[in-house]
Amino acid sequence: MATQADLMELDMAMEPDRKAAVSHWQQQSYLDSGIHSGATTTAPSLSGKGNPEEEDVDTSQVLYEWEQGFSQSFTQEQVADIDGQYAMTRAQRVRAAMFPETLDEGMQIPSTQFDAAHPTNVQRLAEPSQMLKHAVVNLINYQDDAELATRAIPELTKLLNDEDQVVVNKAAVMVHQLSKKEASRHAIMRSPQMVSAIVRTMQNTNDVETARCTAGTLHNLSHHREGLLAIFKSGGIPALVKMLGSPVDSVLFYAITTLHNLLLHQEGAKMAVRLAGGLQKMVALLNKTNVKFLAITTDCLQILAYGNQESKLIILASGGPQALVNIMRTYTYEKLLWTTSRVLKVLSVCSSNKPAIVEAGGMQALGLHLTDPSQRLVQNCLWTLRNLSDAATKQEGMEGLLGTLVQLLGSDDINVVTCAAGILSNLTCNNYKNKMMVCQVGGIEALVRTVLRAGDREDITEPAICALRHLTSRHQEAEMAQNAVRLHYGLPVVVKLLHPPSHWPLIKATVGLIRNLALCPANHAPLREQGAIPRLVQLLVRAHQDTQRRTSMGGTQQQFVEGVRMEEIVEGCTGALHILARDVHNRIVIRGLNTIPLFVQLLYSPIENIQRVAAGVLCELAQDKEAAEAIEAEGATAPLTELLHSRNEGVATYAAAVLFRMSEDKPQDYKKRLSVELTSSLFRTEPMAWNETADLGLDIGAQGEPLGYRQDDPSYRSFHSGGYGQDALGMDPMMEHEMGGHHPGADYPVDGLPDLGHAQDLMDGLPPGDSNQLAWFDTDL
């Protein structure tokens, strides 16, 4: 049982007996884990003649031979003479074909073929018997070899334990010789004393040749299950790990390939390598430059790290991430890049390794290979990038990667598109440079197209919608992005995603995107025409009923449905309706759906962000006289007055605005009292002149963005399990706290209010939100 490790010998172990080694590899008689061979193979031909496709007769050659052979003319006498010669030598020809070794030297036998390259019929018929004869000879030789080796092993074992180091060296050389033949190799591995002696000699010797031969012997034994077990039982693993410190390349190469075979096929080997300190040694070897050696070493690291957190941390402590990233940056050998990307993939799900890989430039290094012809390499790089992407939102120099990811959205490979969308979603989170870059390279169009192509494949639509949500808020190109979604025919499909069969995480993301799209006045009518408003109200009612039902049943804990809290849906839908309500026609539709009682009820919510969006939508609706009256009729004055004293300035300001708009038809003294009340409550902490307040708008922040992938080793990350849905209610650690300044394209000044002295200034000067006010749809998480 051999592995791809065989291939290492030719390239790496500088042996005197290279011919033997080459013939050994040419036989390809080993189990190949696929690292090095990777070759397209055909089934062996039963006739022993190789690939049947290559057996087509070349007719031009036949014709040529025909002309060549028979263009000369013979007399009858010559023909008879030749016939006679053939008849006389028939027996010899048969004997020559079947038993060539029985012929006398120098004996000439006339051939029946003019062209020596073609076998005669007799020779063809003799082929099976020759093959049988060779098989018998090989069997006899095998038995002889086995017998001789069995006889020699006790003596060789003794010699390996000799005091004289020269004798030990000679013994090591001879054992290595024997290990190259299959029969004697089996004899060696069946002797525990011999294998133990080899292991002991290998780790105790100071002689380069002895170390090379003993390591080479173990390498040869490691091609067989029996050999692997013998090495394992003889304590070979700690010895081989020790040899990883050898300054001699051939010893090093033998040691790593043998360990690789053990890790692949021997139970218990992984733990033994870890205990022997193999991980640290292997990481230290990553600065070597032989690509095939590095491919084996990185594959060993992958085997050891997969599913083992402690190993991942040891690799981190040994400087593994930096070394692995360097390999991805430096080399072009596909197998090495593939094995290295596999290690990085395994490490990328470890919360400690993740930032280390990112800081080492892992995102950029992995991005270099996204256009490689090797699909397995591209896929590994994408999986790894997706796992890392939530930790890479602050990285610089991502332009190239972002451009490539946008290109990959057009791929026909569904896995590629899924990963590209997921990575873009995370990289556009809280990073205005990345947002702008993606917009500039046609990201909006590509994402809209991706959503259109994806149909109901939520593993694609959800991250794509999240990416669009991020791109449509809080950066200089946001307004362009909001328009671009419409111009590329995205609005119908976006609204469609609010409907079944969409699940809650996708609905939540879509609601947030619609909220951002509504920031663009040109989208108001198309969104209304696509039926966004009734569906948002329907979702709001359903989610609110769900929260109420749980509250009435005595539940205090917010419950998740498909990883989404229903409170998030309430907040998101209300927030979207709030922005849509800037349009007079939309306000009519919203009011017509009997939403005011629900919005007033939401003012009583214990969640500040829900209070804020509810007050916000009421503020917009209250612009219309009938709506203001309806709000008052629903008993909103009491909760709104209460909210004036909220510690959340956004809530208090919206409440004040609604109360003010509701007072429009009230007597002058009522208005004056309200004005005083508003002034004292809103500016209780730092009174300032109304006209000194900045124009900060009513919107606090912009639509939410996610945290990323969280599970352990499996490469595929569901967006529903601890990933894209973790952006609610200001809970996430990566929230952007940028609320103190104006965000182009996101905020708007309130207009359309009557000139009422100080109160008008109040409307123009809504205070900035504090970090607690980050509604889930107003953050990039």
Partner: nanobody
Framework: QVQLVESGGGLVQAGGSLRLSCAAS????????LGWFRQAPGKEREFVSV????????YYADSLKGRFTISRDNAKSTVYLQMNSLKPEDTALYYC????????????????WGQGTQVTVSS
Amino acid sequence: QVQLVESGGGLVQAGGSLRLSCAASGVSFSRTSLGWFRQAPGKEREFVSVISWIGGTTYYADSLKGRFTISRDNAKSTVYLQMNSLKPEDTALYYCAISNGVLPRTEGAFASWGQGTQVTVSS
């Protein structure tokens, strides 16, 4: 019946060279180890060199300091001993011996012996 016949001995001046041969018969030559011993007048027989049946591995007595080289030709069933930079103290009767051992170095490990060939080195 195993037979070993040595040849190539003779008289040579100090610093000169000789090549001894030992032809074997009646034995599966390629599966045996062959050695050379020598016996100086009035002294015990001493080990000179051995060549193993495994990969032609060789071993020499420490005293030879790289002056002698043992080799074998399995096709001719013959073992050779190339002696260079000969010294008067190399004068001895040189014996060829055969063994089934892996790397035999003592007399007892060899089963069959030749009659020997005389080497005399004059000063």
